[in-house]
Interface confidence: medium
């Protein structure tokens, strides 16, 4: 709305940088062939690039990434009883970000 | 995968708490009747509840919210020339979070 301008602070752009995000650990990251198990923890923190750039034709992208293996619990349910096993999930952390030009493919003439 | 367990640190649950997120300011928050304008900044930071809870039947929810009005620039394009106006967008920040029981409605018998 265009009203109540007095109390409003000027909006500050969310700059393009790494922020802590929550990543849901889906079961198919661990085992695509079997759905009869649970994963613990169900979510973890990752570092991801987010925010906006000063220009419409650029996008906030990761310029440096790091793969981080973490150990989770794979809880298999066998005859209504659990079996606890370890599994490794590889998370992707963004270490640095940059405003990158969006390349739109030109139509072939 | 179940391989390469040695190098992996135990995964730590992303606890239910407020985190900084990026909120895209969509044009219809400012003017639903007109699409012939741009908004600056296109995105801002907000505080939002995220993460997981220790129990299956609970969800991370905001327990306390605050509305925060911010001033943005509405850039109208009139005869290919920009006209700058001010507009207020009200953002929702989460101040506190809690793990809340998910109430699944029971079928009426």
């Amino acid at each position: 709305s265009l009203g109540s301008l007095a109390a409003a602070e000027p909006a500050v752009i969310a700059e393009c940088k790494t922020r802590t995000e929550v990543f849901q650990i889906s079961r198919n990251l661990i085992d695509r062939t079997n759905a009869n198990f649970l994963v613990w923890p169900p979510c973890v923190e990752v570092q991801r690039c987010s925010g906006c750039c000063n220009n419409r034709n650029v996008q906030c992208r990761a310029s440096q990434v790091q793969m981080r293996p973490v150990q989770v619990r794979k809880i298999e349910i066998v005859r209504k009883k659990p079996i606890f096993k370890k599994a490794t999930v590889t998370l992707e952390d963004h270490l640095a970000c940059k405003c990158e030009t969006i390349v739109t493919p030109r139509p072939v003439t | 995968s179940l391989g390469s367990l040695a190098a992996a640190e135990p995964a730590v649950i992303a606890e239910c708490k407020t985190r900084t997120e990026v909120f895209q300011i969509s044009r219809n928050l400012i003017d639903r009747t007109n699409a012939n304008f741009l908004v600056w900044p296109p995105c801002v930071e907000v505080q939002r509840c995220s993460g997981c809870c220790n129990n299956r039947n609970v969800q991370c929810r905001a327990s306390q919210v605050q509305m925060r009005p911010v001033q943005v620039r509405k850039i109208e394009i009139v005869r290919k020339k920009p006209i700058f106006k001010k507009a207020t967008v009200t953002l929702e920040d989460h101040l506190a979070c809690k793990c809340e029981t998910i109430v699944t409605p029971r079928p009426v018998t």
Partner: antibody, heavy 120, light 106 residues
Framework: EVQLVESGGGLVQPGGSLRLSCAAS????????MSWVRQAPGKGLEWVSY????????YYADSVKGRFTISRDNSKNTLYLQMNSLRAEDTAVYYC?????????????WGQGTLVTVSS | SYELTQPPSVSVAPGQTARISCSGD??????VHWYQQKPGQAPVLVIY???NRPSGIPERFSGSNSGNTATLTISGTQAEDEADYYC?????????FGGGTKLTVL
Amino acid sequence: EVQLVESGGGLVQPGGSLRLSCAASGFTFSSYAMSWVRQAPGKGLEWVSYISDDGSLKYYADSVKGRFTISRDNSKNTLYLQMNSLRAEDTAVYYCARHPYWYGGQLDLWGQGTLVTVSS
Amino acid sequence: SYELTQPPSVSVAPGQTARISCSGDSLGSYFVHWYQQKPGQAPVLVIYDDSNRPSGIPERFSGSNSGNTATLTISGTQAEDEADYYCSAFTHNSDVFGGGTKLTVL
């Protein structure tokens, strides 16, 4: 204060029955899985039985299967162990303990224990 | 049934490092927890999920687990660390405890 308090132990004859209770306080009992662990005099720890947060999963050590029944009343914040057909080898201090998650995991909180003596 | 094997006793001089082992078939595939028990008291969790320390447990306690063996390490052992120590793992449908190790601080 977060605590577990067991009760119901005592002297019982072989073949007899006993019901142990464990009262939980200071935390949301219904969010945690629970176990009973016992320790015979001068011996090591032996896991007895487990129950999930909502009571849907229950399992038992082979040594007590068919004789002991674990249950819980989340409205009363109480865990139970019904022990039937008791034997001399069931003599032990019985501890109730809390798992931090609904599925189990480590035992992060223990009661002080209650002594069960099976003897004629 | 699955078994965890611990040495019955371990001795260590004050200030030295004590290591208590716990072995079992493919134990590294499971999460191991360690409990400390002093005479007449209930057990206390000192290490969980192989190597994590609960709040309130001194930094001198650490753990590792790979292959067939998990190890509890106490660096700079103090007199108050004298106790029985039990390893534990949740394997096939049951929580299994090792036989326990009596740690003596000389």
